[in-house]
Interface confidence: low
């Protein structure tokens, strides 16, 4: 018996061929011997089966001795043995219809789980293998689960159902809702304007939700809400903002925040959360601010950084075009009785300068100038 695999919602064509290359009488029946369709001369006739409105044939092929049964908009319950009676012979075809669906929604938040459920006819024992857009293979039976979805899982998942050494392939488009970056860091000199950007890694027609930026300043004992906002059809409106600092927010996507001045008391880390309409859970992006200050007080030239610096970062003080006078894996360095000239304070990572602040040291009878 020939086995044909079909996909729920698709169209399948079951073939039936006579030895004579001409139009002769044929019938298609199901396993209960109920007629589905056949012919009367050159006319298509239909029987009382439940496939009535979804069954068809190709009259253009009858003259060649081919009498296919076409079933449109396949359902799982269409799985059956179909019998073609032509001349004195019977051809049997077993049709197995499968469906593969994603849990509730194909737009999922980063970190959520994706469950793919296979619908299969009774008595079948299929195996399923799915390949994610990043090339990860998962195998299973009736259900396949992927926990902790990552941004790279966005795209087309290709799933192959195997039954009786035959294959049918499903393609499911999954969108992982996330920010482009999980974490970012901004390095600024004291007094500079700070721009924070939170680009999303997906595009949808309408985007509605609400968000908040919580900030943990290094000098503060607890975190504080800096701004709350609403998002309606990609338009941003601020609901509430602290007086200090007075953040400004862009009205369009990508989400964009401006801090008028980088000050030591603002150095620290923020957590921007975005709750999307009709989604459980929130999107998160961490943002970090490191602030540098170079000062000269009497005979002491000091360079300090505040904020989340990694233990491997180097802070240095050097006179322009000279070797560093002091370099430490610390958050403050200083030089006593500095020579006159342009001094540079550098925050660097393996030789790469992340932040630089210059301060002019004048001969001792003058006051310092900040460029």
């Amino acid at each position: 018996k020939k086995v044909v695999l079909g996909k729920k919602g698709d169209t399948v064509e079951l073939t039936c061929t006579a030895s004579q290359k001409k139009s002769i009488q044929f019938h298609w029946k199901n396993s209960n011997q109920i007629k589905i369709l056949g012919n009367q001369g050159s006319f298509l006739t239909k029987g009382p089966s439940k496939l009535n409105d979804r069954a068809d044939s190709r009259r253009s092929l009858w003259d060649q001795g081919n009498f296919p049964l076409i079933i449109k908009n396949l359902k799982i319950e269409d799985s059956d043995t179909y019998i073609c009676e032509v001349e004195d012979q019977k051809e049997e075809v077993q049709l197995l219809v499968f469906g593969l669906t994603a849990n509730s929604d194909t737009h999922l938040l980063q970190g959520q789980s994706l469950t793919l459920t296979l619908e299969s006819p009774p008595g079948s024992s299929p195996s399923v293998q799915c390949r994610s857009p990043r090339g990860k293979n998962i195998q299973g039976g009736k259900t396949l689960s992927v926990s902790q979805l990552e941004l790279q899982d966005s795209g087309t998942w290709t799933c192959t159902v195997l039954q009786n050494q035959k294959k049918v392939e499903f393609k499911i488009d999954i969108v992982v809702l996330a920010f482009q970056k999980a974490s970012s860091i901004v390095y600024k000199k004291e007094g500079e304007q700070v721009e924070f950007s939170f680009p999303l890694a997906f595009t949808v027609e309408k985007l509605t939700g609400s968000g908040e930026l919580w900030w943990q300043a290094e000098r503060a004992s607890s975190s504080k809400s800096w701004i709350t906002f609403d998002l309606k059809n990609k338009e941003v409106s601020v609901k509430r903002v602290t007086q200090d600092p007075k953040l400004q927010m862009g009205k369009k996507l990508p989400l964009h925040l401006t801090l008028p001045q980088a000050l030591p008391q603002y150095a620290g880390s923020g957590n921007l959360t975005l709750a999307l309409e009709a989604k459980t859970g929130k999107l998160h992006q961490e943002v970090n601010l490191v602030v540098m200050r170079a000062t000269q007080l009497q005979k002491n030239l000091t360079c300090e950084v505040w904020g989340p610096t990694s233990p491997k970062l180097m802070l240095s003080l050097k006179l322009e075009n000279k070797e560093a006078k002091v370099s430490k894996r610390e958050k403050a360095v200083w030089v006593l009785n500095p020579e006159a000239g342009m001094w540079q304070c550098l925050l660097s990572d393996s030789g790469q300068v992340l932040l630089e602040s210059n301060i002019k040291v004048l001969p001792t009878w003058s006051t310092p100038v900040q460029p």
Epitope: E218, G268, N271, E286, P308, D349
Partner: nanobody, 117 residues
Framework: EVQLVESGGGLVQAGGSLKLSCAAS????????MGWYRQAPGKQREWVTT???????KYADSVKGRFSISRDNAKNTVYLQMSSLKPEDTATYYC???????????WGQGTQVTVSS
């Protein structure tokens, strides 16, 4: 080099509570996230909970509702309050500190928690 020192482990009856501490040798706000992991004999080390620098917390399903992570920035210490303890919570608990631009995490030496039935 950063030092993380755990304390507070011990033997406790099922249903009881314990509070673990993790003291860091530098400001805990220099870390991207701090958290706790545990390792039972003959098993892989598993993640328990994390507190991000900005205060967001996450928990493994197995401890949700029973364990709570907190921190004291002034003391550079992270805490793990464990209640309704079960025998399957028996493990060595490790404190972990993560810096976003470093490939390696910092780990403490671990503190043993034993829950008897």
């Amino acid at each position: 080099e950063v030092q993380l020192v755990e304390s507070g482990g011990g033997l406790v009856q099922a249903g009881g509570s314990l509070k673990l501490s993790c003291a860091a040798s530098r400001s805990i706000l220099d870390f991207n996230a701090m958290g706790w992991y545990r390792q039972a004999p003959g098993k892989q080390r598993e993640w328990v909970t994390t507190i991000a620098r900005a205060g967001a917390t996450k928990y493994a399903d197995s401890v949700k509702g029973r364990f709570s992570i907190s921190r004291d920035n002034a003391k550079n210490t992270v805490y793990l309050q464990m209640s309704s303890l079960k025998p399957e919570d028996t493990a060595t608990y490790y404190c972990n500190a993560r810096v976003f631009d470093l490939p390696n995490d910092y780990w403490g030496q671990g503190t043993q928690v034993t829950v008897s039935s």
